[in-house]
């Protein structure tokens, strides 16, 4: 190995002034070959028996044993310099003429060959005894990634020769490899923050800063773990890393205290039906802790109600819930609250919502069906069902009539307005059975159909009939 020295920005003329290692006279002019990657030997020179890279006569094993050993000359062993400075270093070797076969010098770093556009120049100094070769390597504006062990390799008579390593140490300000990270913590609960920075140069010492005040006036060796016993309010933490080159500062991170969420906002009714209301909301600030679930509170807005609140729980997302099993044509007050691990938010502002009219809950009553043979029609009569206020306003009826005979089936329906309680429908098929059912209609929809009433339509004028399936109390229809 070479001697360990510290130097920066060594110039070539400084580094290589004076006689070269070995034997060359000072006035002997070298010739140079710049290279982008692999070094090449020069063209054949006087005094050389064979040009490089040409086949040479094989040296017998006895002869090769007699060849003097060849090795790279000792050079500088350790270069220490600051980031962004320039550095130059070299390998040199003396090859006697007795060596017939040599390959170019290649540069290696940390065991890998340096290929590509590296700034390397090879200089050759031939004389009557052989040739001295100097491989120069330079790095402009060094970076941390240039740190490492550099060495030269060369093949001489098929034997690989390796130089002593030149260790390049690029020093700079501390470099953070782990910075503190933002966390959300429970009030008065301990937590840890980590900061790690590296050189070279080492050591790196860490100071912690909380809200622009130093936590420790005595630094800690990197890596440093700061245990914070607990906070009652949001704080900003950072760390300072110091080494012999100066100091650097990490990013500042906010440590937030988890609190209950803010109440949801913008509670809206997206859709109402007779018995359900679809409600949406915008979650409030989560209090630095994820929302877990939400609660929809519903109370009847009518003065006569007893003020009891129905509660519906749902997941925090999506911010949407369909409240079901509500009364038709009713007014409700609705509010939303959400919770995180700390607790429930206050409720949102209450909003008013209404369900729409319901469909009738009972079928028309006292249905009778009579065949008017002369006009070839069915005469259908019924009584209006008892419709509640929430069932809405009666708008009409739907009459379903099904005709069945051997090989024929016909299903038809008619809608009639609410005026009156009778209807006439033309006979569709003779020698058939007609089944009639009637449902009331409001704006809220169609109510249940009545029980079926069957009537047999004869081929000629004989008529059978069935009474209404819903006779009025105390009555029996007969015709």
């Amino acid at each position: 190995g070479g001697t360990a020295e510290k130097w920066e920005e060594t110039e070539l003329d400084q580094l290589f002034s004076g006689p070269l290692p070995g034997r060359l006279p000072v006035n002997h002019r070298p010739f140079s070959a710049p290279h982008s990657s692999r070094d090449q030997l020069p063209p054949p020179q006087t005094g050389r028996s064979h040009p490089a890279h040409t086949a040479a006569p094989q040296v017998t094993s006895t002869a090769s044993k007699l060849l003097p050993p060849v090795a790279f000359n000792h050079t500088i062993g350790h270069i220490v310099l600051s980031e962004h400075k320039n550095v130059k270093f070299n390998c040199s070797i003396n090859i006697p003429n007795t060596y017939q076969e040599t390959a170019g010098i290649s540069w290696w770093k940390d065991g890998k060959e340096l290929l590509g556009a590296h700034h390397s120049i090879t200089q050759f100094y031939p004389d009557e005894e052989g040739v001295s070769i100097i491989a120069l390597f330079s790095i402009a504006s060094v970076q941390r990634s240039d740190n490492g062990s550099y060495f030269c390799k060369m093949k001489v008579n098929n034997r690989e020769i390796v130089s002593d390593p030149i260790y390049v140490e690029v020093q700079g300000l501390p470099y953070f490899i782990k910075q503190p990270e933002s966390v959300n913590v429970t009030r008065n609960t301990a937590f840890n923050l980590t900061c790690q920075a590296v050189g070279p140069p080492e050591p790196v010492n860490i100071f912690w800063v909380q809200n622009s005040s130093r936590v420790n006036e005595k630094p800690e060796r990197s890596p440093s773990v700061l245990t914070v016993p607990g906070l009652t309010e949001t704080a900003v933490f950072s760390c300072e890393a110091h080494n012999d080159k100066g100091l650097t500062v990490s990013k500042g991170v906010h440590i937030n205290i988890k609190v209950i969420p803010s109440p949801p906002t913008e509670v809206h009714i997206l859709n109402s039906t007779a018995h359900s209301i679809l409600v949406s909301w915008v979650p409030g600030f989560d209090g630095y802790s994820p929302l877990q679930n939400c609660s929809i509170q519903v109370k009847e807005a009518d003065r006569l109600s007893n003020g009891s609140v129905m509660v519906f729980n749902t997941s925090a997302s999506p911010h949407l819930y369909e409240i079901q099993q509500l009364q038709a044509l009713a007014n409700y007050s609705i509010a939303v609250s959400c919770r995180n691990e700390i607790g429930w938010s206050a409720v949102s502002p209450w909003i008013l919502a209404s369900t729409t009219e319901g469909a009738p809950s009972v079928a028309p009553l006292n249905i009778t069906v009579f065949l008017n043979e002369s006009n070839n029609i069915l005469d259908i009569r019924w009584t209006k069902p008892p419709i509640k206020r929430q069932d809405g306003e009666l708008v009409g009826y739907r009459i379903s009539h099904v005709w069945e005979s051997a090989g024929t089936y016909k299903e038809l329906s008619e809608e009639v307005s609410q005026n009156g309680s009778w209807a006439q429908i033309p006979v569709q098929i003779h020698n058939a059975t007609c089944t009639v059912r009637i449902a009331a209609i409001t704006k809220g929809g169609i109510g249940p159909f009545s029980e079926p009433v069957n009537i047999i339509i004869p081929e000629h004028s004989k008529v059978d009939y069935a009474p209404s399936s819903t006779p009025a109390p105390g009555n029996t229809d007969s015709m």
């Epitope: 100071f207 622009s212 005595k218 300072e240 110091h242 012999d244 100066g246 100091l247």
Partner: antibody, heavy 121, light 112 residues
Framework: QVQLVQSGSELKKPGASVKVSCKAS????????MSWVRQAPGQGLEWMGW????????TYADDFKGRFVFSLDTSVSTAYLQISSLKAEDTAVYYC??????????????WGQGTTVTVSS | DVVMTQSPLSLPVTLGQPASISCKSS???????????LNWLQQRPGQSPRRLMY???KLDSGVPDRFSGSGSGTDFTLKISRVEAEDVGVYYC?????????FGGGTKVEIK
């Protein structure tokens, strides 16, 4: 080569304020801190505290908390010491010194030439 | 605060002769990692202080090797093997182990 150049002497009345500047050159200002040191007439040196030139975070020795404020203008590589409600006993030479924590501890390696502040009615 | 006591206050010396300054601290300056942050400053007449020595005995760059430092725990010494004219001034010890940093009262070296 790092150089710290301080502002000129100041003569102030008690109760007034003074702002001493320390302009740095020859190095990246934000890669170190600045300590402030007081030397009263015929007395020794007193460390007042230091400021991180990158973050502006300051630390003050107990005797210099309250009326003494360190500040920065990184755009002109300058550190400042402001003293308010001046008293006669604030009469001293105030030094700035480059500072950070190296392998040998706090460095104090380059010093300004000092600024004399005289407080007299 | 750690009190740093220097002696003597004044040290008249003959050129070419040795000089020795003592510095004692009220608490040990050895820190938990085994380092002792005891430093020396030199203040020549009419000049700013200059860093002379750190970690008890390490010379700052450019400081002649006639200066040396020794000591441990609470007792420390700065020695000048052969005083030269340029060594005239006040020498301060200071500690950086404990907060706040504190200085000794200074020792004035003058030529007899």
């Amino acid at each position: 080569q790092v150089q710290l150049v301080q502002s000129g002497s100041e003569l102030k009345k008690p109760g007034a304020s003074v702002k001493v500047s320390c302009k740095a050159s020859g190095n990246t200002f934000t890669t170190y801190g600045m300590s402030w040191v007081r030397q009263a007439p015929g007395q020794g040196l007193e460390w007042m505290g230091w400021i991180n030139n990158y973050s502006g975070v300051s630390t003050y020795a107990d005797d210099f908390k309250g009326r003494f404020v360190f500040s920065l203008d990184t755009s002109v590589s300058t550190a400042y010491l402001q003293i308010s409600s001046l008293k006669a006993e604030d009469t001293a030479v105030y030094y700035c010194a480059r500072d950070y924590y190296g392998s040998g501890g706090w460095v104090f390696d380059y010093w300004g030439q000092g600024t004399t502040v005289t407080v007299s009615s | 605060d750690v009190v740093m006591t220097q002696s003597p206050l004044s040290l008249p010396v003959t050129l070419g002769q040795p000089a020795s300054i003592s510095c004692k601290s009220s608490q040990s300056l050895l820190d938990s990692e085994g380092k002792t942050y005891l430093n020396w400053l030199q203040q020549r007449p009419g000049q700013s202080p200059r860093r002379l020595m750190y970690l008890v005995s390490k010379l700052d760059s450019g400081v002649p090797d006639r200066f040396s430092g020794s000591g441990s725990g609470t007792d420390f010494t700065l020695k000048i093997s052969r005083v030269e004219a340029e060594d005239v001034g006040v020498y301060y010890c200071w500690q950086g182990t404990h907060f706040p940093r504190t200085f000794g009262g200074g020792t004035k070296v003058e030529i007899k």
